[in-house]
Interface confidence: low
């Protein structure tokens, strides 16, 4: 429904607090380098303007679109050209091209300093001195580092962040109370950001149809008792929500997400029996809870799929009349019967079914041609099952750190041109699949593992897209969304790679490594491992293991020494020489 003033409509729907928070997120996701104070000033100006429109929707400029209003505001930033370079050219464009231009300049890996956590007392003082600024700063810092973070979900994180400080800053042992909560929020936040990044990549790189197919499969697994029409409605509404958020339309996105949560809760009897608890919560918690809700039980006595999709003489007629709907029904029926399959596997099966019908419905005897289509599914199902089995066995044998190292070696040999920080980050995340999913029973392993790997490989794809260096990565990332993981799995050692020149500086370490956290120390060692493989791609597992064991012993020895720096300098030279000899460098 059209409103005289879109900005007034959203301000009234969302309330001032959410309006301001969402505008701050939007601005920080677009202008990732701008100082906090500049963004707060812009947000306050927009908010004051919105209030004038609430008072009188016919007031000057109140009829302008949100993109026009926000874009005009962003383009008033004085240092736009100096700070952002060619992004300033966006301001010469008209809407909608101007917004598209801003979107294209979002940076998945902005050159921003690492967030260092201050002392607990310092944080608590800042929280008590000015709670509003403290929480705004949290939104700003997360949003600028994660330009595709799901904005309404970031409001939920901010609410939990505030609750953590409210509780823990009064506790006897503030640190013991607060630090685990902040660690949990950080880890969950990174996971949430990566999951949303995949949704946006799906929409932006592969289109609405690809996202809808993903949503049909996932919602059908989650709500197997819901009718197809109900799932279809939810899919369309969910697609609108994510299209808006991925497109920078954060006010509309948050508003529509709230409407969707309301609809789901009002209609939970026809959707899922698992929604009751979620629907009793306040809005932000409710939306989060619905998004994470467990799969409902499958209806008893579901008939065989073969009757409607293989044995029926009307398969080609039904397919021809409404192809996407028929395929949507196939996906819905298959997914609701298979909560044990990953979404990407279900999409591969649907694609195979579609390809078969395209071929067979043009054949002389269509039924004869597609009669064995379900047999084609068997190898597609077995491939991820076998891969997960093998990797979980390896994980159980090695533990997380060494499993990550095995993946680091594997992926560096596949795509050695990729930057070392990206290989370390991606391989560490790939390795986390073990502790995340291998503990699950068989029926939950595949959806956990393969859908998680899709999220992690998308991180590789978006980071690589910024600075493309490997045709193999580009190929696996762009050819098929659902076949990305099999594509990377199938890559062998890159025989065309010319090994990196040996540089002793890469393997020079200092006493500062001793004061690092265990995680940071692991990253240092894993960085060295990647560099070793880049120097000697044909090194065997045994050779690499020997060098890494020597390296671990070297770090341990020097960190215990009285004169740490001298130890690192002298023993380091010996280690480099021994490693060169061991690897034949």
């Amino acid at each position: 429904d059209a409103h005289k003033s879109e900005v007034a409509h959203r301000f009234k729907d969302l309330g001032e607090e959410n309006f301001k928070a969402l505008v701050l997120i939007a601005f920080a996701q677009y202008l990732q380098q701008c100082p906090f104070e500049d963004h707060v000033k812009l947000v306050n100006e927009v908010t004051e303007f919105a209030k004038t429109c609430v008072a009188d929707e016919s007031a000057e400029n109140c009829d302008k679109s949100l993109h026009t209003l926000f874009g005009d505001k962003l383009c008033t930033v004085a240092t736009l050209r100096e700070t952002y370079g060619e992004m300033a050219d966006c301001c010469a464009k008209q809407e909608p091209e101007r917004n598209e231009c801003f979107l294209q300049h979002k940076d998945d890996n902005p050159n921003l300093p690492r967030l260092v956590r201050p002392e607990v007392d310092v944080m608590c003082t800042a929280f008590h001195d000015n709670e509003e600024t403290f929480l705004k700063k949290y939104l700003y810092e997360i949003a600028r580092r994660h330009p595709y973070f799901y904005a309404p979900e970031l409001l939920f994180f901010a609410k939990r962040y505030k609750a953590a400080f409210t509780e823990c800053c009064q506790a006897a042992d503030k640190a013991a109370c607060l630090l685990p909560k902040l660690d949990e929020l950080r880890d969950e936040g990174k996971a949430s950001s990566a999951k949303q990044r995949l949704k946006c990549a799906s929409l932006q790189k592969f289109g609405e149809r690809a996202f809808k197919a993903w949503a049909v499969a996932r919602l059908s697994q989650r709500f197997p008792k819901a009718e197809f029409a109900e799932v279809s409605k939810l899919v369309t509404d969910l697609t609108k929500v994510h299209t808006e958020c991925c497109h920078g339309d954060l006010l509309e996105c948050a508003d529509d997400r709230a409407d969707l949560a309301k609809y789901i809760c009002e209609n939970q009897d026809s959707i899922s029996s698992k929604l009751k608890e979620c629907c009793e919560k306040p809005l932000l918690e409710k939306s989060h809870c619905i998004a994470e809700v467990e799969n409902d039980e499958m209806p008893a006595d579901l008939p065989s799929l073969a009757a409607d999709f293989v044995e029926s003489k009307d398969v080609c007629k039904n397919y021809a009349e409404a192809k996407d709907v028929f395929l949507g029904m196939f996906l819905y029926e298959y997914a609701r019967r298979h909560p044990d399959y990953s979404v990407v596997l279900l999409l591969r099966l649907a694609k195979t079914y579609e390809t078969t019908l395209e071929k067979c419905c043009a054949a002389a005897d269509p039924h004869e041609c597609y009669a064995k289509v379900f047999d084609e599914f068997k190898p597609l199902v077995e491939e991820p099952q076998n891969l997960i089995k093998q990797n979980c066995e390896l994980f159980e044998q090695l533990g997380e750190y060494k499993f990550q190292n095995a993946l680091l070696v594997r992926y560096t040999k596949k795509v050695p041109q990729v930057s070392t920080p990206t290989l370390v980050e991606v391989s560490r995340n790939l390795g986390k699949v073990g502790s995340k999913c291998c503990k699950h029973p068989e029926a939950k392993r595949m959806p956990c593992a393969e859908d998680y790997l899709s999220v992690v490989l998308n991180q590789l794809c978006v980071l690589h897209e910024k600075t493309p260096v490997s045709d193999r990565v580009t190929k696996c990332c762009t050819e098929s969304l659902v076949n990305r993981r099999p594509c990377f799995s199938a890559l062998e050692v890159d025989e065309t790679y010319v090994p990196k020149e040996f540089n002793a500086e890469t393997f020079t370490f200092h006493a500062d490594i001793c004061t690092l956290s265990e995680k940071e120390r692991q990253i240092k060692k894993q960085t060295a491992l990647v560099e070793l493989v880049k120097h000697k791609p044909k090194a065997t597992k045994e050779q690499l293991k020997a060098v890494m064991d020597d390296f671990a012993a070297f770090v341990e020895k020097c960190c215990k020494a009285d004169d740490k720096e001298t130890c690192f300098a002298e023993e380091g030279k010996k280690l480099v020489a021994a490693s060169q000899a061991a690897l034949g460098l």
Partner: nanobody, 115 residues
Framework: QVQLVESGGGLVQPGGSLRLSCSAS????????MGWYRQAPGKQRELVAS???????HYADTVKGRFTISRDNSKNMVYLQMNSLEPEDTAVYYC?????????WGQGTQVTVSS
């Protein structure tokens, strides 16, 4: 392919009634929204009434109490009963049906309210 055909339009005097029908030919599964929109000359197309998968209805403020939307799921039909028609209701009326496959529109049927 799915095709929508509207019928029931025509010329009617102010205060009169008309019943518009829309039928979907071709198989269309999983309908979650059926609606009627209208477009008067020189104006934008606007929602008149809609009915969702759960049967809940929505009406434009200008037609509330005068128009009633209904659907027949078994026949993929949607109807618009228009009573107490006014000259301002003159427009081309379009039927809209949505499902997971897309958004389907009819060609429109002319409604003219004039004495």
């Amino acid at each position: 392919q799915v095709q929508l055909v509207e019928s029931g339009g025509g010329l009617v005097q102010p205060g009169g009634s008309l019943r518009l029908s829309c039928s979907a030919s071709g198989s269309i599964w999983g309908i979650y929204h059926m609606g009627w929109y209208r477009q008067a000359p020189g104006k934008q197309r606007e929602l008149v009434a809609s009915i969702t998968v759960d049967g809940s209805t929505h009406y434009a403020d200008t037609v509330k109490g005068r128009f009633t939307i209904s659907r027949d799921n078994s026949k993929n039909m949607v109807y618009l009963q228009m009573n107490s028609l006014e000259p301002e209701d003159t427009a081309v009326y379009y039927c809209d049906i949505r499902n997971v496959g897309g958004d389907y529109w009819g060609q429109g049927t002319q409604v003219t309210v004039s004495s």
